[in-house]
Amino acid sequence: MRRGPRSLRGRDAPAPTPCVPAECFDLLVRHCVACGLLRTPRPKPAGASSPAPRTALQPQESVGAGAGEAALPLPGLL
């Protein structure tokens, strides 16, 4: 049985190394991968109760308490 890297990461460990362009941060195993390897959410129909998620965070954006609406994967995680 193989454990993913996530199991080894402490809750208080520092944020991961930023991903290079064209890579996205895989939240489930906690490392950068080619963005094309990750499925992204379906677009929401007009009039949905919450904003349609974006497919990526821009490099100048950070993942924090205010980033909840950003869809993942997260390229260039700061």
Partner: antibody
């Protein structure tokens, strides 16, 4: 839209083996996470494990390495090999795929596995 | 493992009622400013259906009477006005830490 179709369920004797298949269409199993979840009769949901884009697998430790997930990318199908089956493994087995944060947005119809002598 | 405890285990309600289901995790399921908490609906003989992901995001095609809230260890699924098709069992799930775990379910029955 992703569609998932399970097959391979049925009746098996205790100690026996069974392989379930989940055929995916609408997306490649070389993208994302592809899971097995089971539900014993009248009980709740239990996550079995996943195989991801790279072929990495992870299992629920409660299954004690009796189950193995594999894939055939040429068939866009992934599998659950179940060995040393016990009566408590009797359940409907679902395959499902996830969004990047683990939420399972597409599910198969389920296949029933009955372990009984 | 993170234990997920739903309450109540079952409830009886009428069409038009506001229904609230809670889910408590044995430890925080937040990371990177995201709650790895999701809600599903399941009807007898059917596969579960994703309703809410990341604690509060409504899945595509799900009616807006469903909403989710919470962070850390305490989460809530609310149905603002119960409809006949909402009588089902509801499950929470965390994907913050392996192994991923579900709550035991809350059955919503007709009063």
């Amino acid at each position: 839209e992703v569609q998932l179709v399970e097959s391979g369920g049925g009746l098996v004797q205790p100690g026996g083996s069974l392989r379930l298949s989940c055929a995916a269409s609408g997306d490649s199993i070389t993208r994302g996470y592809w899971n097995w979840v089971r539900q014993a009769p009248g009980k709740g949901l239990e996550w079995v494990g996943y195989i991801n884009y790279s072929g990495t697998t992870y299992y629920n430790p409660s299954l004690k390495s009796r189950f193995t997930i594999s894939r055939d990318t040429s068939k866009n199908t992934f599998y659950l090999q179940m060995n040393s089956l016990r009566a408590e493994d009797t359940a409907v087995y679902y395959c499902a795929t996830t969004l990047p944060y683990g939420a399972m947005d597409y599910w198969g119809q389920g296949t029933l596995v009955t372990v009984s002598s | 493992d993170i234990q997920m405890t739903q309450s109540p285990s079952s409830l009886s309600a009428s069409v038009g009622d506001r229904v609230t289901i809670t889910c408590r995790a044995s430890e925080s399921v937040d990371d990177y400013g995201i709650s790895f908490m999701h809600w599903y609906q399941q009807k007898p003989g059917k596969a579960p259906k994703l309703l809410i992901y990341r604690a509060s995001d409504l899945e595509s095609g799900v009616p807006s009477r469903f909403s989710g809230s919470g962070s850390g260890t305490d989460f809530t699924l609310t149905i603002s006005s119960l409809q006949p098709e909402d009588f089902a069992t509801y499950y929470c799930q965390q994907t913050s830490k392996d192994p991923w775990t579900f709550g035991q379910g809350t059955k919503v029955e007709i009063k």
